[in-house]
Each structure stands twice: as structure tokens, then as C-alpha cells.
Interface confidence: low
Amino acid sequence: EAIQVTQPSVVLASSHGVASFPCEYSPSHNTDEVRVTVLRQTNDQMTEVCATTFTEKNTVGFLDYPFCSGTFNESRVNLTIQGLRAVDTGLYLCKVELMYPPPYFVGMGNGTQIYVIDPEPCPDSDF
């Protein structure tokens, strides 16, 4: 049995290619180390977008990933993915692993469908 991970089913990226969504897990165990992985599902394949480990001392994550950011508070992670383009439209899953204290605990959300619409190019101007 795994923990329950919830995330919104649909999110629309901003015109700047930024999508933000929460990833929550329950029950809210008193956990000192939580690993969060964002995966993108395309057909039957799952690819890792970014991953980070949150601790009570490190509540800002994804420092190794310029296009991902996130903050952790108790049993909720607020995720932001930047630099998205129309081709990045797809299902993004949030995987949560409770690393410490043991026993190890893992759960996966049902995924957030992120829609990305490339901004219209500015029309040429005579000015």
C-alpha cells in the first residue's frame, strides 16, 4: 500500500511557458526527508523531468534543475516548471518518496495534464 498523492488534473501554462501546480500527499507523516520526482508520461514511456530531496532544513528544491523549482511545507509541495513550449504539452506525474524515517514509503499522483500554447509571434511592424 502506498501513500496517496494528489495533484490537479489540468493546468494551463502561462504565456511565458510557466506552469505551477501543487503536489500533496497523505497521511501527513512526521517526515524528515521527502524526495519528489516530476515525471512526464508519453505513450507508455515515463521520463524524469526533475527530482529533488526536501528536508526540514532544505525546503526549497530542484536547485540542480534550471527549469524546475519547488517549495515544501509539511505534506505539500508547490511545483513550478518553466521554459515550456507547445511540444511539452503532456501528462506530468508527481512521485513522492518518504525517505526518512523508515519504513520507506512511496506514492504517485494520477498526473497533471499541462497544456502549453506557444505565444503568437508579434506581427511585423512598419514602424
Partner: antibody, heavy 117, light 112 residues
């Protein structure tokens, strides 16, 4: 107020098994890990193992694998530890203790197990 | 297994004095997540142990501020600034960083 109530003392014969209980109250039982600790007479403490009451996952001290089995009953908010093939070495006080930022933030009163023929 | 050593088995003190109890681990008990899970417990005769300090220096709720913990790596100390009669008992250090988690042998604080 969080409370752990353990079962009473038991006298068992060598080779037998014993199952002791730890009833939790005053908090959400499934939200916190439950540990078991052994204290032989006049001796120090030994960590036996820990169970996740939410899903029953366990982590044991290798020394007690095969000796101790940890289980929970979520409906009654009770943790159990069964000890098998008892010998005089198993005579001790056994404590349940709940994780809360620290491994043993709250303790039961202990269950005295005496193994004697 | 990590061995937690409390070299002082018995520590006689006068009430009102400062007491210092040491604990040494056989290897570093810094967890991979950066935390050091070193805890201190007090067990009075006929009672269950009680948590005093967790993560080296954090006092548990209700623990008087005369108790303080310090240390890093492998060497740790519990200090009681002014010993009171209710502080007498056996003090155990414990590491919860690496399985199997282990306790020290205990230091008995008694009246001189």
C-alpha cells in the same frame, strides 16, 4: 494527550510464543511510526524494530529478525509484537514507543516477559 | 553496527552542581539528509525512559532549560546546569541515523 497502554506481564515457558499489545490513544494512530524496544534486567536498551501503522511496512534490527514480528490493527489503534521460540535470553521489559520528530517521543509503560519452566 | 559508548557508568554529583555526560559513536552519525539523529533519554527507577533531547541539541517539549545537548560527528555531550533531585536516574544516548539504531550503555547520575 498521546498515550500508549501496553498489555500486562506474562510468564511463559521456554520454546513458547508470546504476543503483546500497545494500544494508542490521543492521536491519529496511522500518522506516526511505532517502535519496539527491549530492556533486559539491569541492562541498557535495544531497538527491535519499527512499523508504519498506515500500511504495515516494517524495518527490523537484524538481531531480532525471526524472533520478533510487528503488526498493527488499525481499527483498534493497536500495535502488536509477537516473540517466538522464547528462551531465558528473551526475559525482559518490552516497550512500545512512538516516533514524533524523535524516535521515541512517547513510551508505553512496558510489558514484563518472564521465560521460565 | 554503530556502537554508542558512554564511558562514565556512574556520575556522583551534588544537588545544584553542573553535570556533564558524554557519549561517543564508533562512526559518524550524520545522516545522508544532513541531520544528526542523536538523542538523550532519562530513565528513573521503575519508569519508562523519557525523551530529553533530539537531533543533538533540541529540547523536547516540557524539558527544563537546564538540560542542553551539544556535539557533532562522533562526540556528544548532555549538560545539566543545576542538578535537581528529580534529575537522578540513568541517562542513555541513542543514534537513529543508521540501522540498526543503537543506545549507549547508560550513565547513572547519583547523589555524591
Amino acid at each position: 494527550e498521546a498515550k500508549l497502554q501496553e498489555s500486562g506481564p506474562v510468564l511463559v515457558k521456554p520454546g513458547a510464543s508470546v504476543k503483546m499489545s500497545c494500544k494508542a490513544s490521543g492521536y491519529t494512530f496511522t500518522d506516526y511510526y511505532m517502535n519496539w524496544v527491549k530492556q533486559s534486567h539491569g541492562k541498557s536498551l535495544e531497538w527491535i524494530g519499527v512499523i508504519n501503522p498506515y500500511n504495515g511496512d516494517t524495518s527490523y534490527n537484524q538481531k531480532f529478525k525471526g524472533k520478533a514480528t510487528l503488526t498493527v490493527d488499525k481499527s483498534s489503534s493497536t500495535a502488536y509484537m509477537e516473540l517466538n521460540s522464547l528462551t531465558s535470553e528473551d526475559s525482559a521489559v518490552y516497550y512500545c514507543a512512538r516516533y514524533y520528530g524523535s524516535w521515541f517521543a512517547y513510551w508505553g509503560q512496558g510489558t514484563l516477559v518472564t521465560v521460565s519452566s | 553496527d554503530i556502537v554508542m559508548t558512554q564511558t562514565t557508568l556512574s556520575l556522583p554529583v551534588s544537588l545544584g552542581d553542573q553535570a556533564s555526560i558524554s557519549c561517543r559513536s564508533s562512526q559518524s552519525i550524520v545522516h545522508s539528509n544532513g541531520n544528526t539523529y542523536l538523542e538523550w533519554y532519562l530513565q528513573k527507577p521503575g519508569q519508562s525512559p523519557k525523551l530529553l533531547i533530539y537531533k543533538v541539541s533540541n529540547r523536547f517539549s516540557g524539558v527544563p532549560d537546564r538540560f542542553s545537548g551539544s556535539g557533532s560527528g562522533t562526540d556528544f555531550t548532555l549538560k545539566i546546569s543545576r542538578v535537581e533531585a528529580e534529575d537522578l536516574g540513568v541517562y542513555y544516548c541513542f543514534q537513529g541515523s543508521h540501522v540498526p539504531y543503537t543506545f549507549g550503555g547508560g550513565t547513572k547520575l547519583e547523589i555524591k
